[in-house]
Interface confidence: low
């Protein structure tokens, strides 16, 4: 039978040292339905948009694979220059193409990003800034 699209975030948690790059993995199991992927930190109405495949400027974020390829199903991202302020749970969310607006279709289970300070002084300094 045709499988309904699933959004797989294989890593429940990721630990990254401050100043390094975090890789957040996300894979869709199907090309259907067509529509963009967005990444958010947190859930609910107050969630923070981290990356939008369709539009926007996200200078710290790069994609692991070429999302412009129409048969791409890998939506993993890298976030550079991680600080303690980046800690949180990140969700990979598939949208279904719609008019006038795309509609949220399915979310991954989330990946918790933890940030390890290079040293305690550095950690406190970054938290205060």
């Amino acid at each position: 039978l045709e499988e309904e699209l699933q959004v797989i975030q294989p890593d429940k948690s990721v630990l990254v040292a401050a100043g390094e790059t975090a890789t957040l993995r996300c894979t869709a199991t199907s090309l259907i339905p067509v529509g963009p992927i967005q990444w958010f930190r947190g859930a609910g109405p107050g969630r923070e948009l981290i990356y939008n495949q369709k539009e926007g400027h996200f200078p710290r974020v790069t994609t692991v694979s070429d999302l412009t390829k129409r048969n791409n199903m890998d939506f993993s991202i890298r976030i550079g220059n991680i600080t303690p302020a980046d800690a949180g749970t990140y969700y990979c969310v598939k949208f279904r193409k719609g008019s006038p607006d795309d509609v949220e279709f399915k979310s991954g289970a989330g990946t918790e990003l933890s940030v390890r300070a290079k040293d305690l002084c550095n950690f406190n300094e970054q938290l205060e800034n």
Epitope: E2, L31, I32, P33, V34, R70, N71
Partner: nanobody, 118 residues
Framework: HVQLVESGGGLVQPGGSLRLSCAAR????????MSWARQAPGKGLEWVGA???????VYEKSVKGRFTISRDNAKNTMYLQMHSLKPEDSARYYC????????????SGQGTLVTVSS
Amino acid sequence: HVQLVESGGGLVQPGGSLRLSCAARGFSFRDSAMSWARQAPGKGLEWVGAIYSDGSTVYEKSVKGRFTISRDNAKNTMYLQMHSLKPEDSARYYCAPKGVVADEGDYSGQGTLVTVSS
């Protein structure tokens, strides 16, 4: 081996209608999502829309409200009903199982040519 045969294309005036058919063989049609795509001369492949195994549909914004995708599982056939055709709809239309594909080489069908002109 997956076989897809598209038919129903032709020359139509702006504002006219056409119905395209896609006859499928070699896979479980009734259990598969199916899509339509099109390619205008000298341009890349553009996804048009898709129909799921349960009959629900999704469309490219530019054709929504004008095009309707349907399927007849007993005949292993998918249809694309096109109304209010515009010159920019002129293209070779292809069908494919599942989702969007990279290029027309991923289709086993030859496509069917639609020309919208007065």
